[in-house]
Amino acid sequence: MSSKYPRSVRRCLPLWALTLEAALILLFYFFTHYDASLEDQKGLVASYQVGQDLTVMAAIGLGFLTSSFRRHSWSSVAFNLFMLALGVQWAILLDGFLSQFPSGKVVITLFSIRLATMSALSVLISVDAVLGKVNLAQLVVMVLVEVTALGNLRMVISNIFNTDYHMNMMHIYVFAAYFGLSVAWCLPKPLPEGTEDKDQTATIPSLSAMLGALFLWMFWPSFNSALLRSPIERKNAVFNTYYAVAVSVVTAISGSSLAHPQGKISKTYVHSAVLAGGVAVGTSCHLIPSPWLAMVLGLVAGLISVGGAKYLPGCCNRVLGIPHSSIMGYNFSLLGLLGEIIYIVLLVLDTVGAGNGMIGFQVLLSIGELSLAIVIALMSGLLTGLLLNLKIWKAPHEAKYFDDQVFWKFPHLAVGF
């Protein structure tokens, strides 16, 4: 017989989610309006396409990337969509309140939707570490806290460090990774005997996870260039990201084979490592002057990703209770750090070359930004983890971890799907 949602959650989730949605509708009614300025249709379409790319990355890319669990693939995809939809709404309001509100109403533009989608992406990266161990009511809390924390982080960085949109959004990798890992650390860890098979991957879900990775791979250049200011910068960012992810694919597949005693390729390694180059060049994608440098970074990122996928899961599983196939957290934490370090190295090279004290000061500011991002991620992640542990949310019992049948109606009640 299929295990049902506890009665209390059946009451709690719809009430919680619909009340929140009603509150958001009211906030949009009172505080927002559309940008009424003249825009030509061609420019509008071009601007919308970038947002569309980001939505595809979020809904299909990250949605399917996290769907490799044998018994949790439906929930992974649908919960991702739910979080994206909720996260975008809250992020648009929050960004507006933080940046525009003193001047009156929040003006909604295609650019603000683009920003909001990227903010919501942060949650989808983080949630990989906890999917299967939480219910939708808990995920709503996670979305609200993480989007709020990231919005405030970006606002602080923008005001204190005078950083532009691209630079302060590129902290998303590190922020999302450490947020997710700290939430996972707070959640109950042990899987009771007999449920270990649920967090294993299966062929069809693994194929859909590969599909997600392919979508992310195709659209990563759009993500890295979305917030840049001029066509020259965007073009450079697209080229460099493309070269980096191309090399990281080759590195991932060959490195995965190299890491296996029989020379076999691991699906899990490939899922994550194909994206490695895109994450690693993210912060500096517009600054890298030539393809070979981007390719070298893609190679290094691919190797780090495969190495991490080989040696870190054991540690993550033991300490944080993250299953072996949930690799985004530690992968992005390593590669996000690599990306930030690359940017800092560029500034250090500037200081050495110019002997300019002000550039040295910029190095310190960049280190300060990175440290702030990590600290806020860890603190807000721990806060979220503690909130998610409250009895009010009726979290799934450990025996029901990674089980679609807890959340979904399957008429045929098939066990192996």
Partner: antibody, heavy 129, light 110 residues
Framework: EVQLVESGGGVVQPGRSLRLSCAAS????????MHWVRQAPGKGLEWVAV????????YYADSVKGRFTISRDNSKNTLYLQMNSLRAEDTAVYYC??????????????????????WGKGTTVTVSS | QSALTQPASVSGSPGQSITISCTAT?????????VSWYQHHPGKAPKVIIT???KRPSGVPDRFSGSKSGNTASLTISGLQPEDEAEYSC??????????FGTGTKVTVL
């Protein structure tokens, strides 16, 4: 020839609105960010607003935030500045300017530079009762 | 976003060298390389004469040069000419897509 021509200035009462236009010619308008800059009588230049090349993002000086709106129509090669709730201190010559992005490279990184390389001759706005 | 400080006026004889300073109260100039200088003849469109601290656009005479030290940028006109009589303004990127101009300096050729 690369050219920017402002229009729409005039005398207006405090609290009223005015819309300035800037017609661009001689270059691919949709590839460039655009600025409005003003100069009050006897004062220096003051940056007012910028709009990105695709119109996706806009930024304003604190002194005009919430009152002025910059926009563009790339199909008409025209930049606009909608000025609402005008005050006496908004009296100035308003210039539109093209934003040129250039870069130089070392072996390890690119350096981007932004400069207002082409300006119009300006249009005068007088706010007076 | 307070204006960058420039001397109100500078004068010199033809052939002389003059230097106009542009000082920021905050880190606007020091933190960024986006310092440019504009020449503005009354009734005409302003014209950029120095970009990126010290680069001259094509068509600008080589007697104009720019430099930067800490929080102060400088424009030097060596071999002053009568046609150099104009107002000169510096401009710096002030972070998060905003700009700040100098108070302006009137150059008089004696």
């Amino acid at each position: 020839e690369v050219q920017l021509v402002e229009s729409g200035g005039g005398v207006v009462q405090p609290g009223r609105s005015l819309r300035l236009s800037c017609a661009a010619s001689g270059f691919t308008f949709s590839n460039y960010g655009m600025h409005w800059v003003r100069q009050a009588p006897g004062k220096g230049l003051e940056w007012v607003a910028v709009i990105w090349y695709d119109g996706s993002n806009k930024y304003y000086a604190d002194s005009v935030k919430g009152r002025f709106t910059i926009s563009r129509d790339n199909s008409k090669n025209t930049l606009y500045l909608q000025m609402n709730s005008l005050r006496a201190e908004d009296t100035a010559v308003y210039y539109c300017a093209r934003e040129m992005v250039s870069y130089s490279s070392s072996w390890y990184r690119r350096y981007y530079y932004y400069v207002m390389d082409v300006w119009g001759k300006g249009t005068t706005v007088t706010v007076s009762s | 976003q307070s204006a960058l400080t420039q001397p109100a006026s500078v004068s010199g004889s033809p052939g002389q060298s003059i230097t106009i300073s542009c000082t920021a109260t905050s880190s606007d100039i020091g933190a960024y390389n986006y310092v440019s200088w504009y020449q503005h003849h009354p009734g005409k469109a302003p014209k950029v004469i120095i970009t990126d601290v010290n680069k001259r656009p094509s068509g600008v005479p080589d007697r104009f040069s720019g430099s930067k030290s800490g929080n102060t940028a400088s424009l030097t006109i060596s071999g002053l000419q009568p046609e150099d009589e104009a107002e000169y303004s510096c401009c710096s990127y002030a972070g998060t897509y905003s700009y700040v101009f100098g108070t302006g300096t009137k150059v008089t050729v004696l």
